[in-house]
């Protein structure tokens, strides 16, 4: 049986059940290389409390559809009066990066995971030439996730203080020059994740090979190498390589750009101080507030919730967007869709789409940017579920009793962007973390 998602096959992936202190290792095409789980385990559960391993999915007992992968075992589970076996179930949804498997829950018999990934899309528009896993768990099982830094087009310009060259990088995947053919990047070879531009020439100095690694609690490392043997004439016989170290800052701060810290014989070392390198719980909340020791800040957007059936309205030329954030009030146009953002076509108001649902909510404060994300909306033709990204700005003189109002700024591949100036986005900082 052919592997259902070949792009995901090259790696053993990890997911964590934080509540029960369990680490899962997942290999969807072969078996995980963990002796204690046996030779054919595709999903191996490592219970850190008891230091034991249990196979909860066998690679031989795999069944697949386009959006669901199930691994059975021969281990019976004691659900009263039934003959069930322990199994793992992975639901796949279209995403814009390779993404990460997320543990959802586990019953007596089934361990459930969800995975938003380019591999599950109906069209190839989000697929990279080369992409590697872009997250890691530290020794305390806290997730560090650089997926939000991945550029789907264009690249980051590294601060290298060399007037004659420019070094451009992407995170965990190659630079897509076709979707954003900036003049400098146009000459970059396909597949490169680190592109050195000298005058009108561009050189591949590194492609992603291995996934993100953690070297210390707040330092993550990504390595790129130039795969083909052909040496570049300015590298003194060495093969080019790029090492990017992502550093979680010791206190809350604005974002910085990646900086070149060392360069020798086409070996480039880059340091990037970014809060995305911090563990995810430091940056994100599933509610509309971020507060407490964990996050070093106090943010509460719950006063922006509208009651009594009213919504914020944002004009998007062809469409009107109705928003009701930080609550579970149905938007009337999007009745029964559980939408936090509802897109209505002006020329035909019967054409209504959920552009993100209120129970699929993430509030993120990272590198000085405050963002509220709603995902899991109605599908586009690519299979990607519509989502909305609301970027908040602090404005102590915002109208509408300080609440302000969202402004639609654009759409890219079924992701809708808004800006929102409000006094409730004014962040109160605490002490060090």
């Amino acid at each position: 049986q052919a592997a259902p998602f070949p792009e995901l096959c090259s790696y053993t992936w990890e997911a964590v059940d934080t509540k029960n202190n369990v680490l899962y290792k997942i290999n969807i095409c072969g078996s995980v290389d963990i002796v204690q789980c046996g030779p054919s385990s595709a999903v191996c559960m490592h219970d850190l409390k008891t230091r034991t391993y249990h196979s909860v999915g066998d690679s031989v007992l795999r069944s697949a559809t386009r959006s669901l992968l199930e691994f059975n075992t021969t281990v019976s589970c004691d659900q009263q009066g039934t003959n069930h076996r322990v199994q793992s179930s992975i639901a796949f949804l279209c995403g814009k990066t390779l993404g990460t498997p997320e543990f959802v829950t586990a019953t007596e018999c089934v361990h459930y995971f969800e995975w938003r990934t380019t591999a599950a899309c109906k069209k190839d528009i989000f697929k990279a030439n080369k992409e590697v896993p872009c997250y890691v768990f530290d020794e305390e099982l806290r997730k560090h996730d650089l997926n939000p830094l991945i550029k789907l087009s264009g690249a980051y310009d590294v601060d290298d203080s060399d007037p004659d060259t420019s070094l451009f990088i992407n995170v965990c995947r190659d630079i897509d020059t076709l979707r954003d053919p900036g003049s400098q990047l146009r000459a970059c070879p396909p597949g490169t994740a680190a592109c050195l531009v000298r005058g009108h020439q561009a050189f591949d100095v590194g492609q992603p090979r291995d996934g993100l690694k953690v070297v210390r609690k707040d330092r993550l490392v990504l390595s790129y190498v130039r795969e083909e043997a052909g040496k570049l004439d300015f590298c003194d016989g060495h093969s080019p390589a790029v090492t990017i170290t992502f550093v979680c800052p010791s206190e809350r701060r604005e974002g910085t750009i990646p900086k070149l810290t060392a360069k020798s014989n086409c070996r480039y070392e880059i340091e990037w101080i970014t809060e995305y390198a911090c563990h995810r719980d430091y940056l994100e909340s599933k509610t509309c507030s971020l507060s407490g020791e964990q996050q070093d800040v106090s943010i509460d957007l719950t006063p922006l919730a509208q009651s009594g059936g009213s919504s914020y309205i944002s004009d998007g030329k062809e469409y009107l967007f109705y928003l009701n954030v930080c609550g579970e009030t149905e938007i009337q146009f999007c009745n029964k869709k559980q939408a936090a953002v509802c897109q209505v076509k002006k020329s035909d108001t019967s054409q209504v789409k959920a552009a993100g649902r209120y129970h699929n909510q993430t509030l993120r404060y990272s590198d000085g940017d405050l963002t509220l994300i709603y995902f899991g909306g109605d599908e586009c033709s690519s299979g990607f579920q519509r989502m909305s990204v609301i970027n908040f700005e602090c404005n102590k003189t915002a109208g509408n009793d300080g609440k302000g109002t969202p402004v639609f700024t654009g759409e890219v591949d079924c992701t809708y962007f808004f800006t929102w100036d409000t006094e409730y986005a004014c962040v109160h900082h605490h002490h060090h973390h």
């Epitope: 059940d17 029960n20 202190n21 409390k49 829950t105 019953t107 007596e108 018999c109």
Partner: nanobody, 116 residues
Amino acid sequence: DVQLVESGGGLVQPGGSLRLSCAASGIIFSDNRMDWYRQAPGKQREWVATLASYGWKTYADSVKGRFTISRDNAKNTVYLQMNSLRPEDTAVYYCKASSPVLNDIWGQGTLVTVSS
């Protein structure tokens, strides 16, 4: 005050059965992962069974097919049903509760003796 109290231990013949109980107080019981451990005389404490907060269960190889862990959230109690007992199951049995927000909490233990 957070505490766990085990009961149900005693003397039983080989091949017999016992049901151990572990009553919890002072914690949101359903949020906690519950484990049973045991310590035989002169030996190290060993893990026996786990019932996670979501409901999945795992067992040590030595008790698989003979022991069953379960919980009653209404009674804040976790049980260990032990069938086909063997002399090597003789030990003090402890229950443990753990969650991301709490340090591990142990009970005081209950003695199980399997002897003819």
